[in-house]
């Protein structure tokens, strides 16, 4: 059943898609492995808060402590990187804030660009000085913990020295890693001293360890891969918007609504509305009247824009955005003043939102 | 882990109605659509419509229009589709999916026949 | 409505071999199409969204690009364990529509 009657039947369905809207990432807290992470909901009033990691309720364990409207999460790994949300209920509604978090320290060991540079990690030695094998840069081998996307490249690299000059092999948990281990095998660069896997998938997780040695030693060095998953969500709205506006009568206003999405959201402006002196319908719920909706006729949906207000326009405006997996809503009042209590201009005077660090 | 549990199967008489029922766990019932899908045996998939458990927001393919009905229980995160005025064409395995189309029930064949 | 035609209807390949599978939309459609993998008497399976995006656990030789109206579903290797149907679906606007599905067959 419908939790709202319309006014009136507008057809809400865009006669075909609409162009792709500019969408705008949830804010994003990164830490690195091992490190603790403090997130604050940004949500005021709430009398009760939960938290959602990936859409799945979220509990307190060992590591995860939910205090009043904050989260920690001790000792992060890549495993804690997902989309959270905070959830406040209040007694007359509820409201989520969207973050993501990512406990990563690089997307590919060493460098990042093509291994251009590798050339002077392959040292000559004079051949009278036999030496054993010696690591050359480890400022590369420095991160041990990858949290790489699913899908990405991951380039491992280990530059070694020693004379006579070391041979490399690499294991995977412990064991010989082979090309047939993995579908579309693996690169290994001898003279970067590099293991490179393209387009890795979660099957890649594991510890990735290169041997090092010749006739007068071995050293090794060992690398932990994570591949983080990715899944498609319903439609995230910035924090804080709408914001609460206020003009004047025959004033101007504008609402913005920033949408992340990764299919095609369908944005819709509604704002209660009264019909023969009631706000509910005899069914009790409440008359809505949309606005404004994304499609063919439909300029930037994400704003909507109200021109020579009226004292009847104040109210509460709704920004509903779905998509294919679900929905999300935020909403924001607009208090229309008389002309007399104007202060200072007449056009717009606008709420920014609150962004706290 | 993720589950999405329907209804057993149905063998209707044409004219009447079904109601496939579609019980999901491990997720945020409210948080994400439900869609309903069918396929006749031996043929392709046909979107029938999708819920929005959270406030009841319905979405229909209009082919469908009048003689399907979804509907949802957040107290059990139970989603249902009902259709109506069956006929022997309707014949066909019914399935619900999470709204991200990631996770499927296991499917409810529905029999039309005389 | 969006319509959804997909070619061929059905194919037949040696394991080893690459597939390719295509799907072209009757409208623009951004990236908004997924690809499922569905076996006889089972639930279709979600492979690819959002036209190149490869869902969580699935293997790296399923993949699947294109934007608009023209798009591709490809198998780079081809396995044993992938002769099934799969079918391409828009996610764009309601009424949400799929292919009429290829059915691929082992030589």
């Known amino acids: 059943r419908p939790s709202f009657s319309l006014v009136e039947d507008t057809t809400l369905e865009p006669e075909e898609p609409p162009t792709k809207y500019q969408i705008s990432q949830p804010e994003v807290y990164v830490a690195a492995p091992g490190e603790s992470l403090e997130v604050r909901c940004l949500l005021k009033d709430a009398a009760v808060i939960s938290w959602t990691k990936d859409g799945v309720h979220l509990g307190p364990n060992n590591r995860t402590v939910l205090i009043g409207e904050y989260l920690q999460i001790k000792g992060a790994t890549p495993r804690d990187s997902g989309l959270y949300a905070c959830t406040a209920s209040r007694t007359v509604d509820s409201e989520t804030w969207y973050f993501m978090v990512n406990v990563t320290d690089a997307i590919s060991s060493g460098d990042d660009e093509d291994d251009t540079d590798g050339a002077e990690d392959f040292v000559s030695e004079n051949s009278n000085n036999k030496r054993a094998p010696y690591w050359t840069n480890t400022e590369k081998m420095e991160k041990r913990l990858h949290a790489v996307p699913a899908a990405n490249t991951v380039k491992f690299r280990c530059p070694a020295g020693g004379n006579p000059m070391p041979t490399m092999r690499w294991l995977k948990n412990g064991k010989e890693f082979k090309q047939e281990h993995r579908i579309g095998g693996y690169k290994v660069r001898n003279q970067h001293w590099s293991l490179i896997m393209e387009s890795v998938v979660p099957s890649d997780k594991g510890n990735y360890t290169c041997v090092v040695e010749n006739e007068y030693g071995s050293i090794n060095h060992t690398y932990h891969l994570d591949v983080v998953e990715r899944s498609p969500h319903r439609p995230i709205l910035q924090a804080g918007l709408p914001a609460n506006a206020s003009t004047v009568v025959g004033g101007d206003v504008e609402f913005v609504c920033k949408v992340y999405s990764d299919a095609q959201p369908h944005i819709q402006w509604i704002k209660h509305v009264e019909k023969n002196g009631s706000k509910y319908g005899p069914d009790g719920l409440p008359y809505l009247k949309v606005l404004k909706h994304s499609g063919i006729n439909s300029s930037n949906a994400e704003v909507l824009a109200l021109f020579n207000v009226t004292e009847a326009d104040a109210g509460e405006y709704i920004c509903k955005v779905s998509n294919y997996i679900g929905q999300a809503n935020q909403s924001a009042w607009l208090t229309v003043l008389p002309k007399q209590q104007a202060p200072g201009r007449e056009k717009e005077i606008t709420a920014s939102p609150d962004y706290l660090e | 882990q993720v589950q999405l549990v329907q209804s057993g199967a149905e063998v209707k008489k044409p004219g009447s109605s079904v109601k496939v029922s579609c019980k999901a766990s491990g997720y945020i019932f409210t948080s994400y659509n439900v869609h309903w899908v069918r396929q006749a045996p031996g043929q392709g998939l046909e979107w029938i419509g999708s819920?929005?458990?959270?406030?009841?927001?319905?979405s229909y393919n209009q082919n469908f229009r009048g003689r399907a009905t979804i509907t949802a229980d957040k107290s059990t995160s139970t989603a249902y589709m009902e259709l109506s005025s069956l006929r022997s064409e309707d014949t066909a395995v019914y399935y619900c999916?999470?709204?991200?189309?990631?996770?499927w029930g296991q499917g409810t064949l529905v029999t039309v026949s005389s | 409505d969006i319509q959804m035609t997909q070619s061929p209807s059905s194919l037949s390949a040696s394991v080893g071999d690459r597939v390719t599978i295509t799907c072209k939309a009757s409208?623009?459609?951004?990236?908004?199409i997924a690809w499922y993998q569905q076996k006889p008497g089972k639930a279709p399976k979600l492979l690819i969204y959002?036209?190149?995006y490869r869902y969580s656990g699935v293997p790296s030789r399923f993949s699947g690009s294109g934007s608009g109206t023209d798009f591709t579903f490809t198998i780079s290797s081809l396995q044993p364990e992938d002769i099934a149907t799969y079918y391409c679906?828009?996610?764009?606007?309601?009424?949400?529509?799929f292919g009429q599905g290829t059915k691929l067959e082992i030589k």
């Open positions: 819920i929005y458990p959270d406030n009841g927001d319905t």
């Open positions: 679906q828009q996610h764009s606007t309601t009424p949400y529509t």
């Open positions: 959002s036209a190149s």
């Open positions: 999916a999470r709204g991200d189309f990631a996770y």
């Open positions: 409208n623009g459609i951004s990236n908004d």
